[in-house]
């Protein structure tokens, strides 16, 4: 039976330009975390692997960080990165979690300026 | 003046499907998210996903995922929602609404689409 | 999925109260960032739902100031301090801070 429930950074408004952090947390279960992937709109942007370490899509390399933890951070933001966010917990004995995070990215005009600023 | 023209009520047949459109007008379709949001007889809210034009990205709530399909149309600065397989519970009141920047609230939503499935 | 909950249901009122909503949510709405998107709507029967609050407490454009909004974390309200013939209908909250967006069950302002 799946008790745990992802947590996550919650929705986020962002400015052209800016890095965000995006971050799941797993909680309320005993279940080992084998592998965590990242994924927007269906493409893998990266992987965590308990045993292997991370990986980074070739194509995201230039403006994608592994971390914070099982945390991901993006930088040098298009507006084409507005989007759904996809944090996926692949778990043994429990299966798959799954959070998710919508990334609005705005001109540096409308965006909240909090949100240039990583999480400390 | 911000504008979203949603098309007229629509009576259809049960396992028929339907689109409904919403056609923006006073400011950048492209800027914007359009969200859609379900008013079901018991005048609950639901909010069924969004899409963002500039990208076609989407977001779906995962209990109207594989209900409805959103897509649009960036020529004619349109929004659609498809409704497959209709049962009598998607009879409701659908709206479009343009997401607020920054703020994730919706500022301008459209007069609403009246569906009712029946045989 | 985020549950909100909004009481009262029913809100009978007389022209001229001061009225409060309140709304619940079943975690924080309070982002990484420290933004929370908490937003309130009016809809009127027969009209499509208006935008009254945004951002916990931002009025939007052309609201009147007898509105306003507050709380933090879980708890939110909306004040009318002065109840007039077009403030009648149904209040919505909305939590957009986490997937998906959830409405509150909606309160009914109606004249006792």
């Known amino acids: 039976m799946m008790t745990g429930t992802i947590e996550t950074t919650g929705n986020i408004s962002a400015e052209k330009g800016g890095s965000i952090i995006l971050q799941c947390h797993l909680s309320s279960t005993t279940a080992q975390v084998t592998q965590v992937n990242w994924e927007q709109q269906d493409q893998l942007l990266a992987i965590c692997n308990a045993d292997l370490g991370w990986h980074i899509s070739p194509s995201f390399k230039d403006r994608v960080a592994p971390g914070p933890g099982l945390g991901l951070t993006l930088q040098s933001l298009t507006v084409n990165d507005t989007g759904e966010y996809f944090c996926i917990y692949h778990t043994y004995p429990d299966g798959t979690y799954t959070g998710r995070i919508f990334l609005e990215v705005l001109e540096s005009s409308v965006a909240e300026h909090g949100a240039r600023f990583q999480i400390p | 003046e911000v504008q979203l023209q949603q098309s007229g009520p629509e009576l259809v047949k049960p396992g028929a499907s339907m689109k409904i459109s919403c056609k923006a007008s006073g400011f950048s379709f492209t800027a914007y998210t359009m969200n859609w949001v379900k008013q079901s007889q018991g005048d609950n809210l639901e909010w069924i996903g969004l899409i963002v034009p500039y990208n076609g990205g989407t977001s779906y709530n995962l209990k109207f995922k594989g209900k409805a399909t959103l897509t649009v149309d960036k020529s004619s600065s349109t929004a659609y929602m498809e409704l497959l397989s209709l049962t009598s519970e998607d009879s409701a009141v659908y709206y479009c609404?343009?997401?607020?920047?920054?703020?994730?609230?919706?500022?301008?939503w459209g007069q609403g689409t009246s569906v009712t499935v029946s045989s | 999925d985020v549950v909100v909950t909004q009481t009262p249901l029913s809100l009978p009122v007389s022209f001229g109260d001061q009225v409060s909503i309140s709304c619940r949510s079943s975690q924080s709405l309070a982002n990484s960032y420290g933004s929370t998107y908490l937003s309130w709507y009016l809809h009127k029967p027969g009209q499509s739902p208006q935008l009254l609050i945004y951002g916990i407490s931002n009025r939007f454009s052309g609201v009147p100031d007898r509105f306003s909004g507050s709380g933090s974390g879980t708890d939110f309200t909306l004040k009318i301090s002065t109840i007039e013939p077009e403030d009648l209908g149904m209040y919505y909250c909305?939590?957009?801070?986490?997937?998906?967006?959830?409405f509150g069950g909606g309160t009914k302002l109606e004249i006792k």
């Open positions: 609404a343009r997401g607020l920047q920054r703020f994730f609230a919706m500022d301008f």
């Open positions: 909305l939590q957009y801070t986490h997937q998906p967006p959830t």
